[in-house]
């Protein structure tokens, strides 16, 4: 998913001296800002293909677009992998690979990117409108998740492009490195920003997306660097097998939570931002989480309606067990 | 701390069949597939088969198709391993392990009596 | 089925030893997409369950002391152990992490001259 960045354009500031320092003070701020909010993001891509010969194969292709070391891929269908999804595979770069039905063969085709051929007929088989979710895990990045389906109309042998999906899945191993020192950064230049509030204000350039969108601005990657604006978590539901993602019951939980930009995880207004994401409408629905980390051995209560918690198995020890190198 | 508890020991008659347990616990158990192994005094290790908790489509050795049943109780954090129509060729030392084998069950010694 | 064969099985040493034994596969364990090898050592001790040595061929499970060193690729595949201690005395177990069923070696045993 890409957006166009909402960092507003500055108009020149007033010539002389002061003019010039101010230019120098405002325009350093908002490039580190960008490169702040743009620099390392991954992302994870998914394709679903349909065979053309065997109507009940499926081919699903994932791939990761980051700069970390993967440790870990999992494979769910029916939704995310722990939240209502069923395994279907475990790929793991040096320990090997799993698998289970209707699973047939996982494979790494390249260090970042995997695929699963699944085959089955009756309860196991999966359907048209089944989707496929792939969890990467990470080192630094955390985890980052994507689900992805077939097209409704889409023929046999024929599939969506792959398609980067608006998923984020960022644990605390990727909040706490290097995303942590880049948030620290940008809050650090936000407050630099401020405190230059009492100089003559530039004029800015009406925004031409949403009104939700000045304030995602510190969230929405710049347009030039093309990279994805990761919302906590967004995907589409559309399987046949029983959904249990929407079910999410509202149980408080931290503060925290409130400072989410969970209104990113909407549609935007503009058409291009969606246009080559093959994402069906119909029977679609949007929830929000953020993978962090919970204490070894516990699953937290899910926080607030859409808003769940899916952490990894072991703790803030990242990446453990099958999660990867411990 | 990651626990895998299976009885020390079961007898069975010739013919019967028996479930085996392996308790987990100190980890979430749906995060984690669990393998079984089988051991004959003295001689080596043969792989069973392994089961996700959540899929319902374990993964078996062709040997032991027609002799094991995998299933897992999530509610209990409990993995089972039904063997059946025994003879004196299961009397052996059966362990559940965890994951990529990170953790490992003590075993249990299934004796089948005649 | 893979088939894993290990040699020899059985070894006398005396501490402070080098100490190599080996393992042949007779499928590749070699996986073409990243060009990992798939496959793991174990040690297990009398009356004890097989413990993780080393997995994907050559990394080192976290807390087994770097004396033991896996290697090899495809078929061929090699345990290292630079200087014997008398608590490595056991019986060291390769295994096939590349596809179903996940076979394992028959051992080789490493005991005291």
């Known amino acids: 998913m890409r957006t166009e960045a909402q960092v507003p354009a500055l108009q020149p500031p007033e010539p002389g001296l002061e003019g010039a320092m101010g230019h120098r003070t405002l325009v350093l701020p908002w490039v580190l800002l960008t490169l702040c909010v743009t620099a390392g993001t991954p992302e994870v891509w998914v394709q679903v293909r349909m065979e053309a010969t065997e109507l009940s194969s499926f081919t699903i292709r994932c791939g990761f677009l980051g700069s970390g070391s993967i440790s870990l891929v999992t494979v769910s269908w029916g939704g995310p992998n722990g939240a209502g999804g069923t395994t279907l595979a475990v790929l793991h770069p040096e320990r090997g690979i799993r698998q289970w039905a209707p699973a047939r063969q996982a494979r790494w085709e390249t260090q970042s990117s995997i695929s699963l051929i699944l085959e089955g007929s009756g309860a196991s088989s999966p359907c048209a409108n089944t989707t496929f979710c792939c969890k990467f895990a990470s080192f630094p990045e955390g985890s980052w998740e994507a689900c992805g389906s077939l097209p409704p109309s889409s023929d046999p042998g024929l599939s969506a492009p792959p398609t980067p999906a608006p998923i984020l899945r960022a644990d605390l191993a990727g909040i706490l490195g290097v995303s942590g020192v880049l948030l620290f950064g940008c809050v650090y230049l936000l407050h630099l920003l401020r405190r230059h509030k009492h100089r003559p204000a530039p004029r800015l350039q009406p925004s031409r997306t949403s009104p939700q969108a000045p304030r995602a601005r510190a969230w929405a990657p710049s347009q030039a660097s093309q990279a994805a604006l990761h919302v906590p978590y967004a995907t589409i539901n559309t399987s046949c097998r029983p959904a249990t993602l929407d079910t999410a019951h509202p149980h408080g939980g931290p503060s925290w939570w409130a400072s989410l930009p969970t209104h990113a995880a909407h549609r935007p207004q503009g058409p291009a931002a969606w246009a080559s994401t093959p994402i069906p409408a119909r029977g679609s629905f949007v929830s929000v989480e953020n993978g962090l980390y919970a204490q070894a051995g516990e699953r937290p209560p899910h926080t607030g309606p859409g808003l769940t918690l899916f952490p990894d198995p072991r703790g803030p020890r990242a990446m453990e067990g099958p999660l990867g190198v411990r | 701390q990651v626990q895998l508890q299976q009885p020390g020991a079961e007898l069975v008659k010739a013919g019967a069949s028996v479930k085996m347990s392996c308790k987990a616990s100190?980890?979430?158990?749906?995060?984690?597939?669990i393998t079984w192994v089988k051991q004959r005094p003295g001689q080596g290790l043969e792989w069973i088969g392994d089961i996700y908790p959540g899929n319902d489509s374990p993964n078996y050795n062709e040997k032991f198709k027609n002799k094991a049943t995998l299933t897992v109780d999530t509610s209990s954090s409990t993995a089972y391993m039904q063997l059946s129509s025994l003879t004196s060729e299961d009397s052996a030392l059966y362990y559940c392990a965890r994951g990529y084998y990170d953790y490992w069950g003590q075993g249990t010694t299934l004796t089948v009596s005649s | 089925d893979i088939v894993m064969t290990q040699s020899p099985s059985s070894l006398s040493v005396s501490a402070g030893e080098k100490v190599t034994m080996s393992c042949k596969s007779s499928q590749s364990l070699l996986n073409s997409g990243n060009q990992k090898n798939y496959l793991a050592w174990y040690q297990q001790k009398t009356g004890q369950p097989p413990k993780l040595l080393i997995y994907?061929?050559?990394t080192r499970e976290s807390g087994v002391p770097d004396r033991f060193t896996g290697s090899g690729s495809g078929t061929d595949f090699t345990l290292t152990i630079s200087s014997v201690q008398a608590e490595d005395l056991a019986v060291y177990y390769c295994?096939?992490?590349?596809?179903?069923?996940?076979?394992f070696g028959a051992g080789t045993k490493l005991e005291l001259k």
């Open positions: 100190g980890y979430t158990f749906t995060s984690y597939w």
């Open positions: 994907g061929a050559s």
């Open positions: 295994q096939n992490d590349h596809s179903y069923p996940h076979t």
